[in-house]
Amino acid sequence: IWELKKDVYVVELDWYPDAPGEMVVLTCDTPEEDGITWTLDQSSEVLGSGKTLTIQVKEFGDAGQYTCHKGGEVLSHSLLLLHKKEDGIWSTDILKDQKEPKNKTFLRCEAKNYSGRFTCWWLTTISTDLTFSVKSSRGSSDPQGVTCGAATLSAERVRGDNKEYEYSVECQEDSACPAAEESLPIEVMVDAVHKLKYENYTSSFFIRDIIKPDPPKNLQLKPLKNSRQVEVSWEYPDTWSTPHSYFSLTFCVQVQGKSKREKKDRVFTDKTSATVICRKNASISVRAQDRYYSSSWSEWASVPCS
Amino acid sequence: RNLPVATPDPGMFPCLHHSQNLLRAVSNMLQKARQTLEFYPCTSEEIDHEDITKDKTSTVEACLPLELTKNESCLNSRETSFITNGSCLASRKTSFMMALCLSSIYEDLKMYQVEFKTMNAKLLMDPKRQIFLDQNMLAVIDELMQALNFNSETVPQKSSLEEPDFYKTKIKLCILLHAFRIRAVTIDRVMSYLNAS
């Protein structure tokens, strides 16, 4: 058993049929010695008396809020949560496996630039009685500070018969140099509590590996004389690290019709303009990627050909 | 430690071209190592990230773009105080800071060159003949060093008398390649910045 926060404790249980469970001793936080009784949750049934209560925790029915009283007055609470371990593996029931970039990916993180600011998100099908808390650091043995905000519900979407909820959090490394060469990864730890179930999820990454620039901005078209070709130009996104001559981007320009079958055009360039063939009803899209370290491409920025 | 006397090439473009070739060669070599050594811990997640130039060169600090010198977090080493004091960076070409930056890059390349050559000598003794260093990568390191055009005393190649542990050597190769790729990215960024200045 260990303390998650004040008056909240996590009991780690090996979860299998007829498991013996864990013996837990609760102590009432009071100077009083006599006349103390214990109850669980909303029940008025007295579980025991005395300053300490010894219980055998085997299942979720044994978890919950234990309260010690004296003469009708509440003295203190202890909330017991369960953390299940099945076949040596901690349970991951609360969050959904996003399977990208690999299986068992529960947390996904992205950074728009090298400033040390990043966003992580996760998915769940659970809508109520759910809380998250997020901690982060650079390295684990001698951790350097990373400050994370509160996790918030950022999107809801329907997937078949199920509703899916996306939560996200923003974090900022306390003293980040955009030009630094990372040798210690960022560690992100998410504590998830659903009713009386506790789970924890972690992710470890270098900022350079989670870079995903914002889409290029200010796409403009200039038709070329006597030709179906157009010159398309754009600018670096405002959120990208500066100076741009040091933090350079490379771009992919694509012309795509409404249907997959339609003819396309595609060209890669390090410049902020390109010449492509523009076709009626097609659209021109441009995306960006770090020129020197191939992490993710940005989303597309698009304009219609006409 | 005496920095080599600088005679930087006034035309940055050859260096930019060579640094792009360097990054490409290192990335290819790393990819080849990851494929060939698939049963060794050779991915970014599996290895310890070590920097053989740590405390010996200061490329990131010495080559910091002017715009980042206002960022306190980037100024954690003594050498960088030159940047904030000196207005010499305005002219850029053959400035003291640029010479310091390029000589630091040169020293990095020299250290990695020695490490890679020593390692290749060991790998050539491996009866499995599983992996060797790409000669193209070694050639590209050499070309960039020549383009940087510094005069510096040669570092003797380390020779080892004991029987090499090939497993450890291959893991060290992965560690070296990962670190060198990150340094090659920095070098490419620096050359691109200097070329634009």
Partner: antibody, heavy 118, light 107 residues
């Protein structure tokens, strides 16, 4: 399966003109750009240009601007290359190439050999 | 026009060898480089598009790398069916241009 049937070998005299054809099956030429590529006897490849059969719009390499004319007939799924004022320099194999993009060549016909004699 | 220089002009190898063919552009073409193989008395066929993107039906022993001005086609363990001409082609701008080719022949 995509098949490109190019017209047979041509032997023509210097100064004459010739029209080569390329009929596609397994794809609709309207959905592709049709490129034409010349391969001289010493194996050098030269891009002549492309045509969009859907609207007849075409782009030529500058050096073939006055030499080549590309056309297409979507009803017969056939593209044509007309070469004029022929000289021995035009002796080559000519390939038609439908491409999803106007940038590279997904498919190659079997080629038509053109021999220009003086 | 963008000029592509291929080297070497001829490469003599034994089946089982691994080889690298080079293509250099007269100016930066980013990743807009494609590779073709032409066997004797056959039409060319596309091997690799946009520097490193594989083409369905092409054996995995063929791979491409590079960007900017320097590009490489690698054949990991050459097979007898791989002998022939190899051409690179740029597509960053029109006119599209080809390299003069590298002949891969049996040693």
């Amino acid at each position: 399966e995509v098949q490109l049937q190019q017209s047979g070998a041509e032997f023509v005299r210097s100064g004459a003109s010739v029209k080569l054809s390329c009929t596609a099956s397994g794809l609709n030429i309207k959905d592709y750009y049709i490129h034409w590529v010349k391969q001289r006897p010493e194996q050098v490849l030269d891009w002549i240009g492309w045509i969009d059969p859907e609207n007849g719009y075409s782009e030529y390499a500058p050096r073939f601007q006055d030499k080549a004319t590309m056309t297409a007939d979507t009803s017969s799924n056939t593209a044509y290359l007309h070469l004029s004022s022929l000289t021995s320099e035009d002796t080559a194999v000519y390939y038609c190439n439908p491409g999803e993009l106007a940038r590279y060549f997904d498919y190659w016909g079997q080629g038509t050999t053109l021999t220009v004699s003086s | 026009d963008i000029v592509l220089s291929q080297s070497p002009a001829t490469l003599s190898v034994t089946p089982g060898d691994s080889v690298s063919l080079s293509c250099r552009a007269s100016q930066s073409i980013s990743k807009n480089l494609h590779w073709y193989q032409q066997k004797s008395h056959e039409s060319p066929r596309l091997l690799i598009k946009y520097t490193s993107q594989s083409i369905s039906g092409i054996p995995s022993r063929f791979s491409g790398s590079g960007s900017g001005t320097d590009f490489t086609l690698s054949i990991n363990s050459v097979e007898t069916e791989d002998f022939g001409m190899y051409f690179c082609q740029q597509s960053i701008s029109w006119p599209l241009t080809f390299g003069a080719g590298t002949k891969l022949e049996l040693k």
